[in-house]
Structures are given as C-alpha cells and as structure tokens.
C-alpha cells in the first residue's frame, strides 16, 4: 500500500489500528461543479434499453433518497421502435457507501453502509444454455 | 420531513444545527451479502454499448480504488456484430459520497464528498438538431 | 372480454408425446406475450415456457428440449408440443397471457390436466 | 438458478393487515407481482411491476419490493381473501421467470 507521513494537525485519537470510528464532516464537498446534470437525464428515455426511476427513501440513511433504476422492458427497443426480445435490458449496478445511523435514531452517530443500486440499464445479449 | 425520536443511547454532542461533525464507524456492513457479483461482471463485454474499466486510486479518498467506465466506440454493436454509428454509446453516470482525508494525510478526520462517476454504458437514440 | 381455454391433457405412458391447445378469444394471440406455466398436484406454480409477441421463445431447464411452444395466427391458437415425457412432468398446464411488459402474466386459462403414469 | 423464498403461511383476523413477504437476491432490482390462487381456480394477478393493482383488484391489496425482499399487504383482510399466493419475478440473468413457493393465508 501507499504510506502517507501522518499531518501533525490531526486531531487526537486512539488509532491502534486502522481506525474503527472517526470524525466525519458532513458539510459535503462537491467535485462535480462543472457538469451539466440535464447531459444524462434523458438517457433512461432514449436508451435502447429504457428505465424508470424509483425513489427509495430510508430516515435512518444519509443520503435518505436515493434513486435505483429498473429496466423498462424484459428486451430492447430496436430500429423500428419495437421490443426485440432476443436481446434482454439489464440493470447497471453499483456497490455505494451510504452512513447508517447507529444506535438507530442519532442525529451524529453513523456506521458506513455498502448498498448496491442499479444505475441505469443497458441492452445485451442474452445467455441461452443449448441442451444437447 | 419524517421526525425520529431521538434515541436517548446517543453519544453526547452539541447539534444545534444538523451536526456538521459526526462519528462514523468504519466497520463497513455489507447489505449485498447474497448478491453474486459474477452476474453482472460480464455485462461490459455482452452490451451493444460495451465499456472497459478503469482504476481510479486516490489514498486520500475512501474508498480508495474507483472503477471508471468508459464506453468503447462511439456508436453502438449492431446484429451483425458491426459499429453503428446512427446510435450513441453514452456512459450513465452517478454520483456517490465518499470520504476524503480532511486535513489531508489524517488517518482519522475525514469530510464527505460527491463525486461523479460512469458506473457503464448504454446505447441511446443521438439528438439531431436540424438545420432550417 | 379475453378468454383462454386449454385442452389437449389426458393419461400418457412415460416416453409418450401429447400436445397441449390453448384457444384465445377477444385478442390476438400473435401481438401478445403468451406462455405455459404448470402446477403439480398439491405444489405451487412452475413457468414452463413462453413465446413473446416478436417470436422469440425461452424455455424453463426442466423441459428445455423436449416440449416446443408454437402458435397458429389463423386459429389464434397456443400450442405446446410435448415430448419424451416424464413422470415429473404431470401437472395442470394453464395457458397465460403476458402483460404488455412481459413482467407479468394477467390472463389465466381454466387448465388442463396432464398425468404421466405407466 | 434464481430461487424466490416465501413463507409457507400466514395467519391473520378479518379486518387486520396481512403481509406476505418474498424474498431473493437483489430483488428490488426486479419488478415483483403477486398471484391469488384460491382452491381448484386459476391464478389471478393481483399486483404488477411491485406496486401495480390491475382494474378489478380491491384497494385493499397493495405491494412494495425493496433491497431483498418484496411485500403483499392485505389491509382489513376479508375472509374471501383466503388463498394461496405467490410471488413471481423474471430473471434477467436467465431470461426466465421465477415463482415463489407460495403461502397459504388463512383468515382466523
């Protein structure tokens, strides 16, 4: 791994080993300034592989929202604009960090959390088992 | 907004406001534990808008590793196997907390952050602005 | 007003062929998703097989090779051709409409029954 | 293959709320239906796409799907609410569909 020199400014803490509970603020940094949200918002209606958006909500999370996709179809929009069901939309999914309150219920105290939520869909080809 | 009562258990703090210092535990608890993760895993090779995966290290950023996607061609994989340009392979893009060392190099201090990442591609009809 | 109806079950030696019928009415069977699901005596549901309004058919494992859905447009008829059957195979065999999705089956024939036994 | 995992029974007083869970990996990634099958009748679809009540169901059936697991809730449940029910999903690994094993609710 990379070793980093310690900073002398850190704040005090018992780290015997990696530590179990640190000091998190929550005041979020943004690095996504620059980026134009409307750029993927219509993705999951002009993809071949279209979605819906559903809002899955939890008080005891942060962030309380979040939004997991579902495939629109079982098969693809072709050129025609039909489905094609030899091809098969599939969710996009990825594992993200979320903080969980913990004991439930605390404004301040908070475990780390890894959560998979699907994205987005995208259209493949299907895996057909042949029987011999 | 839903009003929880707060737990009486609660480590002590001064949260006047929504606590912009909280205590995390970084024992991370894994909600995807019946989940397998080969299923999804060849989906960068099986879609029509198939991506590759890049490795984003940061060891101020926890997590530290990111995976990156990025679409492979500019259009789509047709039946034949064949680039079509007449469609778009565009990454779906999310954006996700981390936590980033705050002050830098501290093993115990941390401060929330967003950031923006491709998750993978689909295939999307282009926008043709016509000319009058 | 959408109706199934199924027929073609009955008593077959194990190894033997039978084919399943299922007429529809009050749709068109050829611009719809249309499937076979089974129920052994006493057991719960079983999806065997489906043909999606584009033509393309999948089948559950457990007959994949042996049984075939088909459909007649002129008869506005389901077919399942069964062959090599076994005992494991006695059920009732309804007939299902998907819905527009594919998700989801929301038209149910009555059933037919169909016993495998020596 | 994709398996889905309900509770053999349920028991609940009229005009209580019953729930039926079905559970399976991811399957809030999925959209969830629900099946009413009452003794020597074929099935009838009572929820679609998780949370969908088809024209005729009563109100009082609703659904949710979630993380792992997907719910049928029964509020002010009726004595003719009285069957089997099963969950079913379609795998899109598999290009299959998926039933649960069904659940017996019986109304005390």
């Known amino acids: 791994g990379i070793t980093i020199p310690r900073n002398p400014g850190c704040p005090n803490s018992e780290d015997k080993n990696f530590p179990r509970t640190v000091m998190v603020n929550l005041n979020i940094h943004n690095r996504n300034t620059n980026t134009n949200p409307k750029r993927s918002s219509d993705y999951y209606n002009r993809s071949t592989s279209p979605w819906n958006l559903h809002r899955n909500e939890d008080p005891e999370r942060y962030p309380s929202v979040i939004w997991e996709a579902k495939c629109r179809h079982l098969g693809c929009i072709n050129a025609d604009g039909n489905v094609d069901y030899h091809m098969n939309s599939v969710p996009i999914q990825q594992e993200i960090l979320v903080l969980r309150r913990e004991p439930p219920h605390c404004p301040n105290s908070f475990r780390l959390e890894k959560i998979l939520v699907s994205v987005g869909c995208t259209c493949v080809t299907p895996i057909v088992h042949h029987v011999a | 907004g839903i009003t929880i009562p707060r737990n009486p258990g609660c480590p002590n703090s001064e949260d006047k406001n929504f606590p912009r210092t909280v205590m995390v535990n970084l024992n991370i608890h894994n909600r995807n534990t019946n989940t397998n993760p080969k299923r999804s895993s060849d989906y960068y090779n099986r879609s029509t808008s198939p991506w590759n995966l890049h490795r984003n290290e940061d060891p101020e950023r926890y997590p530290s590793v990111i995976w990156e996607a990025k679409c492979r061609h500019l259009g789509c994989i047709n039946a034949d196997g064949n680039v079509d340009y007449h469609m778009n392979s565009v990454p779906i893009q999310q954006e996700i907390l981390v936590l980033r060392r705050e002050p830098p190099h501290c093993p115990n201090s941390f401060r929330l952050e967003k950031i923006l990442v491709s998750v993978g591609c689909t295939c999307v009809t282009p926008i043709v602005h016509h000319v009058a | 007003q959408v109706t199934l109806k199924e027929s073609g079950g009955g008593l077959i030696q194990p190894g033997g062929s039978l084919r399943l019928s299922c007429a529809a009415s009050?749709?068109?069977?050829?611009?719809?998703?249309m499937s076979w699901v089974r129920q052994a005596p006493g057991k719960g549901l079983e999806w065997v097989s489906i043909?999606?309004?584009?033509?393309?058919?999948y089948y559950a494992d457990s007959v994949k090779g042996r049984f075939t859905i088909s459909r007649d447009n002129s008869k506005n008829t389901l077919y399942l051709q069964m062959n090599s059957l076994r005992a494991e195979d006695t059920a009732v065999y309804y007939c299902?409409?998907?819905?527009?999705?594919?998700?989801?089956?929301?038209?149910w024939g009555q059933g037919t029954l169909v016993t495998v036994s020596s | 293959s994709y398996e889905l995992t309900q509770p053999p029974s349920v028991s609940v007083s009229p005009g209580q709320t019953a729930s039926i869970t079905c559970s399976g990996d991811?399957?809030?990634?999925?959209?969830a239906s629900w099946y009413q099958q009452k003794p020597g009748q074929s099935p009838v679809l009572v929820i679609y796409?998780?949370?969908q009540r088809p024209s005729g169901i009563p109100e009082r059936f609703s659904g949710s799907n979630s993380g792992n697991t997907a719910t049928l809730t029964i509020s002010g449940t009726q004595a003719m609410d009285e069957a089997d029910y099963y969950c079913?999903?379609?795998?899109?690994?598999?290009?299959?569909?998926?039933f649960g094993p069904g659940t017996k609710l019986t109304v005390l």
């Open positions: 299902a409409r998907g819905r527009n999705s594919g998700f989801s089956f929301d038209y």
């Open positions: 043909i999606y309004s584009d033509g393309t058919t």
């Open positions: 796409q998780d949370d």
């Open positions: 991811d399957l809030g990634s999925k959209y």
């Open positions: 009050g749709f068109t069977v050829s611009s719809n998703h």
């Open positions: 079913q999903t379609w795998d899109y690994w598999t290009s299959k569909y998926v």
